[in-house]
Each structure stands twice: as C-alpha cells, then as structure tokens.
Amino acid sequence: QDPWAAEPRSACGPSSCYALFPRRRTFLEAWRACRELGGDLATPRTPEEAQRVDNLVGAGPASRLLWIGLQRQARQCQLQRPLRGFTWTTGDQDTAFTNWAQPATGGPCPAQRCVALEASGEHRWLEGSCTLAVDGYLCQFGFEGACPALQDEAGQAGPAVYTTPFHLVSTEFEWLPFGSVAAVQCQAGRGASLLCVKQPEGGVGWSRAGPLCLGAGCSPDNGGCEHECVEEVDGHVSCRCTEGFRLAADGRSCEDPCAQAPCEQQCEPGGPQGYSCHCRLGFRPAEDDPHRCVDTDECQIAGVCQQMCVNYVGGFECYCSEGHELEADGISCSPAGAMGARASQDLGDELLDDGEDEEDEDEAWEAFGGGWTEMPGILWMEPTQPPDFALAYRPSFPEDREPQIPYPEPTWPPPLSAPRVPYHSSVLSVTRPVVVSATRPTLPSAHQPPVIPATHPALSRDHQIPVIAANYPDLPSAYQPGILSVSHPAQPPAHQPPMISTRYPELFPAHQSPMFPDTQVAGTQTTTHLPAIPPNRAPLVTTLGAHQPPQAPDAPVLRTQATQLPIIPTAQPSLTTSSRSPVSPAHQVSVPAATQPPALPTLLPSQSPTNQTSPISPTHPHSKVPQIPREDGPSPKLALWLPSAAPTAAPTALGEASLAEHIQRDDRWL
C-alpha cells in the first residue's frame, strides 16, 4: 500500500497505534490534528517503536517528510544529550532511541526548530522550521488495551472492516484499539457489528463471540427489532439500537436518551445512564450535579498573563499597566513604544481555525468515557500507565474525519508550552511547584488607569473553539465575573534534582481542572479582587507588596492557599539510548538519571532567586509537562478566548461583571 495515497494508514500494537496522515501541514497544524483525534504527534522513544514507524512509513520518496513530536525552543541546544535539547510534545526528554541524520554540531541554535522524519531510506530525523508545511505527519494513539483482529469465518462475505476511535477505516489491522468497531458482512446478506469493549473480568475484548454469520433468525421482519437485529450464538435474536439510541423497555424499539434534554449544555448518547453530559470549552461539570456546567477562573493560573488578567464568562484577557503595551502574543507586556513585530491577523483566524461546523465538532471523537470520568492522558497515552476509558462511542463516521485546515493557513501559532492558551483536550501534569515572584508588578497609577475594553465581541462561528467533551480532562476556564488577577511568571526551582522517568505523573482526581501546559503549581497565589467598576470606566488597580498588609477595606485581598503536591521518588532507572546514524552503527548510550539535567519549561523569564516568595523543596521533582506546539514569530496583541460555538453571556460592560464579588471557591487545583 502506498503511504502517499490520499488516505491515512495506521499500524497498531496491543497498546498503541501509529497513523500516517499524508496531508501537508505545519508542525502546529499537525499537532492539533493529532490532538483532535485523541492522540499526539508520534514519539518513537524505543527501537521497537521506531521499527513500527519504519514499517508504517515504508519506502516513500526522498522528497517527502513527516512531522514527529519533537521540538526545541530557540537557544535550547543541549548537544550532549540524546535529544539535543529537543523535547517530545508530551513534555519530556526521555528516550531510548534517536535517529538523527547528522552528528550534533555546535551552534547558537538561534531559532525554534521541529523534527521531521524522512519518508525514504532510514527514516532519519531532520530538524527544520516549524512553520514549514511538510508533506504529512505521524500520530500516535494509546489506549487501555486492544482486541485482536477477528478470524475470518466461512459465512463471511468479505474481511471485517474496522473503524478505530481515531477514524481510520481498514481491513488490515492486527490489533484494534479499545473502542474500535468491527463490521462483518455475511454471505446471507446480514452482518454484525462488534465493539472492542471492556470485559467484566478485566481487559478488553469484542462485545460478542463468534460465530457471527449463521442462522436466519432475523430474516423475518428484522426479528421485530426497530433498528438492528442480532442473532445470538444459541439461535435467539436480540435487538440493538444504532449509535445515539438505547433500547427501550420493550427490548425492541429504540429511544434517544438525549431527547429530554437532561444536560445543561451538551448531551451525548452513551455512558452508564445511556447518555453523558459535556461542557463547552471554558466550562466544567459542576461537582454536585454533573448535568450542570460551571467554570473556573483562568486568571487564577500563575503566569497566564504577565501583568494583569481580566476574567469573564468563558474567557479572559490580558492587560498591561500604564506605560506598557500588550505584546503580540497577547500575554507579555513591554514598555510602550518598543519595537516589536505584530501579527497581522486577529486571534480568531489563528487559534480558532479549521472552520469546522459546530455540528462536525460535536461528532468528532470527543469522548471515550461516559459520565464525567476525567482521564489522565488520552493524549499522552502510553503503555505503562494507560488511561481508564469508559465507553461512549458512536460507530458512525464521516468519510474523512481528518481536521480540515484551510490551506494554506496563516501560521501565527499560539505560544507553545506557555501557560496561556486554553486549548482543548490538554491533559496536563501538575506535579511541579511554582515560585511566585514576590516583587510588585508595575500597575497603573490612580491618575491614569488603563483603558480596558468594556465589551467582549462575540467571535463569528468560524472563529470559535471546537466544543470539547467534558470527559476529557477539564481545562481551566473562566466563570468568575470580572476578576483582575496579578500573576507572575512561573520560575523553575533552583535546586531540583534531575529526573528521568518513563511514567507520566498522576493527574488530579476527577473534577479538578489541570493546569495549562508548562504552568507550575503555586503554593501561594496572589489574586487581586477589585471593587465594582462602573460601565465604561477603567478599573483603578493597586497591589500589595510582598509583606504589606491591606491598607483599606477596599484594598485588594490576598488569598493564600496551601497546595499539597504529590511527591515522586527521585530514584529513577537509567535509560539506555539507542541511536541510528548513517555515520556509525547503532550504539547504546547510557543516560543515567542522575546526570541528566531536568527538562525545564521553555520560555521562562529570567528572575533572580531573591524574587521568589517561597523556597521549593527538592522533593518536588520536575514533571513531564505536555507542551503545546509553538511556532516562531509574533502572536496577536489581544488574547481573547471564547469557548463555545454559541455566543456566551459575557457581560457587555465590566460593570456588569460584578467585580466586587469575592466569590470563594474550591480551587484545590491551583
């Protein structure tokens, strides 16, 4: 099979699949496309995984390149390390395999780089510009388990057709990921659909045993079934309903579990109750009632804005103090009048791209789980710590579920691995503590308050973030009306021990929103709550010094929360790195854990240790934090995030946001 045919192809093992998508994309577009299907760009870390990639890619043309999930920020060269300073998009630098095309050469590494794999020959790794739209990309999908391909039966009309959760359809799989559908056509004209499901005794298996093609129990009147009639092994028939319906009490007719609108925002058939509720981006399920949706405050997240953050229903915006202006990335502040490149497009064109209908987004493979189960890593699935998926899968697929990104797409990207973008489906580790700067940010004087827009324009349908199922881990979201928060960039701890681990850290329990990529957990969070602001007036902002008590009743309130962080043992087994290189035979490079420097978060501002409010214990090692791809260059000046495809009830003026409310909330995840 020619991998450069129009259709994607994949190869699956018992715990993960690789898929090749021959579609021209930039690195960011490719990363998004894999993420939207529930996976990540391929991270072949072992010789065995690399062999599977080799088999999948085959012998392509020398001119073709495929993105894999490796990227490096500018000036992050570490040529002595196996990955040379590159980081997997899963957030870490662990590897037991490399395949660089050339030996490492010294240099300043002035620009961000991403890695593509040659389609020909040895499938060597080449580095280059992340904004280049190369010929295709490799995704990796992990899962809890897999079902073996079905054995052909005598009565079959042809081979079973399998559809995976990531929308690849083929007859040639050896293993089928949990949640896959097998369609078997029988010579008698009927067929059977099987689902790869969890078995009561543990593990996964097909939803029914063979033989699948015998008897004629359904032939008269479809066995009395409204939708599907299934002939059981013992000869009797049972009725099933097509995706989106459940069997009614009579055992024959089918009903739509979402017809009575049991969910506040979105309902999807499947799950234990026959349906599962989902919240739009920017919202999360209420803990006391999973049918309702509430939201969280992005401004609580350390480093989400460099200076000031205003939160509103379903979104937030960053602002700068007097004498500073918002940088093109929509987050950073620089002295007014400083030269800086500006992106020429609005945010909507860039972050909220792909132009998909809300309907299409709803139909995407958003949820593997019923109810509100939040899973620790659909997107960084790995064999050693698989996520626990419950099943809520609808086996009806459009012909091409590949995200349709208009080409050529402008390549302003959101910042990668920076704690800014409430991009959907992020599964984020929160085992790194943060050091919050105790120095005061520069804030507007009382005489010249900043001008904050009083209205938040709704984005057009084309510019809205896709709807996300709530049983992906929750994203930090905005619902506290109008709270300005002064947050400081996160700092790496000064003396943390290095760690190499092949396991991902645990995530928080269900209903606790994980942090954004590269956001670190703060023991102390300074949130400045402001009094109510009349419409069309800018807020007057003051802030407290590091140890300065409130001076007046209306002064901002400091809220301090002690966060209990999980402690991960630092003793880790060493990794052995296998390297394929054209200049030398494959060799083994031992990379002891003790010698590898920690994978620091990228793009942290430099601050002196004296600005740190609390020392960080070395018992909190770095975790591997998933990174959002970041492409070079400026990003839009105003960061405006709207989570839903339908306009949210954002206040039309800051005054309506009731900034005076001091809403106490359970922010255990901060």
């Epitope: 450069w4 021209r24 930039t26 043309p61 020398a62 001119s63 073709r64 390149l65 660089w100 095309a101 050339q102 050469t105 002035p110 620009a111 961000q112 593509a116 040659e118 020909s120 080449l126 580095e127 280059g128 510009s129 992340c130 904004t131 280049l132 739209a133 190369v134 490149a341 992106a343 020429s344 497009q345 050529p408 797409e409 402008p410 390549t411 302003w412 492409e631 070079d632 260059g633 400026p634 990003s635």
Partner: antibody, heavy 124, light 108 residues
C-alpha cells in the same frame, strides 16, 4: 554534479502557447521536487508551480488561472512547463529550480539548484 | 499572500564594507526564509536557507538572521564579486513561494 539545463529562447505571438523543458542530471530525478519561477524584466521573481516527479503531484500558483501545466518525463529526467494564452505580460525569463530536501541534517524547502533560464518574448 | 519587502532597494558600498540587507514579511513566516544572489544574465544562487544556515560552499562572510517577520542578510566584508542583486524568499506556506523585490548592491 547536479545540473538543470533548460531549452532555448522562444518568441511567441499573443494568444499562443509555449512549452519549455528542463533536463536534470547528476541526481536521482524522482527524489526532488521541481519548481518553475519566472522573472519579468525589472520585476521580482514569481513562483508559478511545482511537480513532484515521484508521483506527478502538482500545485500551481492561482494567479495563472489554469494557464500553466507542468509535467515530467521520468525516463528522460525532464520536466516541462507549458503556458497558454500568452500576453505581453508573460515576457520573462522562466527558470526551473530544484527544491532541496535536506542540508547537513536540516530539512528545508529553499531552491538549491536553478536552470540557466529560458527567455520567452511575447510580441505581435 | 505573504508579502516580502526588502530594504534598501538599491545601495552603494565599497570593498571591505559591512553591508546589511533587511527583509520584512507581512506575517509570521517562522524561519522559512532563504536568501539568493543573482548576477546579471545568471540564475539566482542560494546563499542562506532556513533564515540563518549558510548553504554549502557559500563564504563565511555571508550570514543570515531573524525569525518571524524580520530577517537580515549581512555581508561582513564586501568583496568585488559580491556586487549583485539579492533576493529574500519565504516558503512558510509552501508551496506558495514569494520573493522580495530585490536589493541591488552596487560599487560606490
């Protein structure tokens, strides 16, 4: 060594079609994409389209509204570019150029080798 | 389309001078920028690829820098054979290449 040798100059009437060739040598023809770029007198270089000889995949600059067709003859390691409905605005030097794949461990899509150019003059 | 604007369009310099040519893109092009040298009656020659990487055989006096929207080509010490026209090219939305209008470097 790598060489791209283009066909000779052409003088054409308005409304006519011109087809020029670009013969590649010194490398495996199907391993590299061929682009066509033109340069009108005193104007900047303008990309017209490309072909991947491996599978005849082509993409064209929308500006040429279907007037351009790029083909290859793999057996002859030669690329061709045909431009129809010529006008005086099409008077230019037409270059074929090879897109590089990788240099010293970097992938890149710059054009590493160029033909010498074919001058096309459109005049009534 | 992404537009590239070079400055200056013309410049005069002497042998031994340090020369800097700037190329601005109308939107972010990452580092997908190349620089070419073209002499009268000849095809362009690749000097710099991926914004800052010197192509094989190009003298070390040529260097490139920049990312995003602003790029520079620097000739550290001008030689007589360097008088030519220089073009920047972007290919971030490959295959839709665009070129700058050129900078003609003349002997003072």
């Amino acid at each position: 060594q790598v060489q791209l040798v283009q066909s000779g100059p052409e003088v054409m009437k308005p409304g006519a079609s011109v087809k020029m060739s670009c013969k590649a040598s010194g490398y495996t023809f199907t391993d590299y994409v061929i682009h066509w770029v033109r340069q009108a007198p005193g104007k900047r270089l303008e990309w017209m389209g490309y072909i991947n000889p491996y599978d005849d995949d082509t993409t064209y600059n929308q500006k040429f509204k279907g007037r351009v067709t790029i083909t290859v003859d793999k057996s002859a390691s030669t690329a061709y570019m045909e431009l129809n409905s010529l006008t005086s605005e099409d008077t230019a030097v037409y270059y074929c150029a090879r897109r590089g794949n990788s240099y010293d461990g970097y992938f890149d899509y710059s054009m590493d080798y160029w033909g010498q150019g074919t001058l096309v003059t459109v005049s009534s | 389309d992404i537009q590239l604007t070079q400055s200056p369009s013309f410049m005069s310099a002497s042998v031994g001078d340090r020369v800097t040519i700037t190329c601005r893109a109308s939107q972010n092009v990452g580092t997908a920028v190349a620089w070419y040298q073209q002499k009268p009656g000849q095809a362009p020659k690749l000097l710099i690829y991926s914004a800052s990487n010197r192509y094989t055989g190009v003298p070390s006096r040529f260097s490139g820098s920049g990312s995003g929207t602003e790029f520079t080509l620097t000739i550290s010490s001008l030689q007589s054979e360097d008088f030519a026209t220089y073009y920047c090219q972007q290919y971030t939305n490959y295959p839709m290449y665009t070129f700058g209008q050129g900078t003609k470097l003349e002997i003072k």
